[in-house]
Amino acid sequence: AQNITARIGEPLVLKCKGAPKKPPQRLEWKLNTGRTEAWKVLSPQGGGPWDSVARVLPNGSLFLPAVGIQDEGIFRCQAMNRNGKETKSNYRVRVYQIPGKPEIVDSASELTAGVPNKVGTCVSEGSYPAGTLSWHLDGKPLVPNEKGVSVKEQTRRHPETGLFTLQSELMVTPARGGDPRPTFSCSFSPGLPRHRALRTAPIQPRVWEPVPLEEVQLVVEPEGGAVAPGGTVTLTCEVPAQPSPQIHWMKDGVPLPLPPSPVLILPEIGPQDQGTYSCVATHSSHGPQESRAVSISIIEPGEEGPTAGSVGGSGLGTLALA
C-alpha cells in the first residue's frame, strides 16, 4: 500500500489508477477507516450521507473535503478500463496535526544549586499523533534520570477533537559552581516523520549558590541502620546553625507527610520502612540543605548486622544495605 499523510481539516484526493478519465466507469472504492465497520464500498453514483465525508469525482478519484482522525485507514480502488483490464490502487492514509508552538509555563526565574528545582512546564496543544516533548540545556538534549535531571510527563486527549495536549515538567539539580545563567528550551517532535520539530522560546533562570553551611549531620540509632523486624530506628538531624532551621524528612527522595522535627522515630519496623532516608534543613536566610542519605534495612533473624557503613556528600549514599 502507498502511504499517504494528510493534514487534519485539509482536502485529500486519492487517484483511482487505470480508471477512465470520465464516465461511464467501472470502478469501486473500498474504505476501512475509523468511520466504517469493516469495509465500506463507494461507487461513482454516490449520494447519501457519505457524500459529505468522501465522494467519487467524475474522473474516478476519491475526494475527502476535510480529513479527520476517523479517516485514518485503508483506501482501495478497483477499476476496469475500456479494454477490460483491471487495475488496483491501495492507499494507507494517516492524518496529522501540527500543534501550536510549544510554551514553557510556570518557569522559574531562579534555581538553587545543589538541590532539585522545578525549571518549568512545557505545554504543547493540539497535536496528532501525540508526538513527544524534549528538553534542551544550552542547545543540547537533556536526558531524564541523568545528572539530577527528572521529567514528569502527562498526555491528555481532547474528548471532542481527539487532539493531544502534552505536558512535561522539568526538574534539575544545578551543579555548584556551574553556569550561572543556563538556557533551557523545549521542543515538540511530531509523531509522523518528515515534519520538523517546534521549539519554545528559551528561558534563562539565574542559578543561586547557597552560602556553604556547616554540614547537616544525620545520626542513626542503631548505628548502621540495620534492625530486626519490629525494632525501632531513631534518626536525628543535627544542624549547627542558629536559629534552628525547620527540618523535614525524606524517604526515597520523597518528602514524608510529617510535621517538621529534628528527630524521626521508626517504631515497629516492617518491610515497608526499608529505604533511603535523609533530612532537609530549611533556613530562613539560606536555601534548603539536605543531609547525607542513610539506608534503613531489616536484618532477618540469623543474619549478621553490618558494622557502620559509610556515605559521603549529600548524594544518595548507602548504609547497611541488607
Epitope: 502527562q154 520523597v254 507527610p257 510529617l258 510535621p259 522515630i265
Partner: antibody
Framework: EIQLQQTGPELVKPGASVKISCKAS????????MVWVKQSHGKSLEWIGT????????SYNLKFKGKATLTVDKSSSTANMQLNSLTSEDSAVYYC??????????WGQGTSVTVSS | QAVVTQESALTTSPGETVTLTCRSS?????????ANWVQEKPDHLFTGLIG???NRAPGVPARFSGSLIGDKAALTITGAQTEDEAIYFC??????????FGGGTKLTVL
C-alpha cells in the same frame, strides 16, 4: 491493645472555646504522629493538622490556623485540640488518628461538638 | 487547593471483587501522595486500611489491597464480605504539607 480514647460530646455557646482530648494507650505515645480530622454533618473529612508528640512540632491546614491549636501532654500520653471562637460552622465530629510515617492506622471514636445558643 | 474525587456509591455481591478509586484534580496520583484508605462503619467507627498507597495497616484482612491504577489510587476488595459494607474514604498528601480527603464511597454488599 492500641486505643485512642476521645473525650465525650460537647455542647458549647457561640464565641466560646472547647478542648478535645485523645488519650493514647497500647503503644509508645511519642513514637507516633497524631492527626486531627473534622467530619461535618453529611460531609466528607477535612484534615485539621498534625502534631509530633516527641518534639511538639505541628503542621496545620491553613483553613484551621488560628481556629485550632494542637498540643500534647507526654506525661499522660494525651493529644489535645483546642477550638476557639466557635460558630455553628464548627459543629462537627472531630477525630484523632495515629499516623505511622504515612499511614493513618488507628482512629479515635470521635468527639461531637455542637455549637448552639 | 486540590480536590480528591471518589465514586459516590458502589454495589457488589459477597465473594465478588470490587475496586474503588481516588482521583486528584492536580494530575496523576503517584506514590508520593501516600494514598490512605479509611473505612467508616456506623457510629463513627473509623479504621485505617491502607497507607502509603499499598501498605496494609496492622490487623487488616488480606482481601483489602491498595495500588495505583492509571492516574488514580485504588482500593481493591477481593472476595467482598457483608461486613465490608461501609463508607470508604481516601486521603492524599500533597507536598505543600497538606492531606486532602475524598468525598467517600458508600459500598453496599448485597
Amino acid at each position: 491493645e492500641i486505643q485512642l480514647q476521645q473525650t465525650g460530646p460537647e455542647l458549647v455557646k457561640p464565641g466560646a472555646s472547647v478542648k478535645i482530648s485523645c488519650k493514647a494507650s497500647g503503644y509508645s505515645f511519642t513514637d507516633y504522629i497524631m492527626v486531627w480530622v473534622k467530619q461535618s454533618h453529611g460531609k466528607s473529612l477535612e484534615w485539621i493538622g498534625t502534631i509530633n508528640p516527641y518534639y511538639g512540632s505541628t503542621s496545620y491546614n491553613l483553613k484551621f490556623k488560628g481556629k485550632a491549636t494542637l498540643t500534647v501532654d507526654k506525661s499522660s500520653s494525651t493529644a489535645n485540640m483546642q477550638l476557639n471562637s466557635l460558630t455553628s460552622e464548627d459543629s462537627a465530629v472531630y477525630y484523632c488518628a495515629r499516623l505511622r510515617l504515612y499511614a493513618m492506622d488507628y482512629w479515635g471514636q470521635g468527639t461531637s461538638v455542637t455549637v448552639s445558643s | 487547593q486540590a480536590v480528591v474525587t471518589q465514586e459516590s456509591a458502589l454495589t457488589t455481591s459477597p465473594g465478588e471483587t470490587v475496586t474503588l478509586t481516588c482521583r486528584s484534580s492536580t494530575g496523576a496520583v503517584t506514590t508520593s501522595n501516600y494514598a490512605n484508605w479509611v473505612q467508616e462503619k456506623p457510629d463513627h467507627l473509623f479504621t485505617g486500611l491502607i497507607g502509603g498507597t499499598n501498605n496494609r495497616a496492622p490487623g487488616v484482612p488480606a482481601r483489602f489491597s491498595g495500588s495505583l491504577i492509571g492516574d488514580k489510587a485504588a482500593l481493591t476488595i477481593t472476595g467482598a464480605q457483608t461486613e465490608d459494607e461501609a463508607i470508604y474514604f481516601c486521603a492524599l498528601w500533597y507536598s505543600n504539607h497538606f492531606w486532602v480527603f475524598g468525598g467517600g464511597t458508600k459500598l453496599t454488599v448485597l
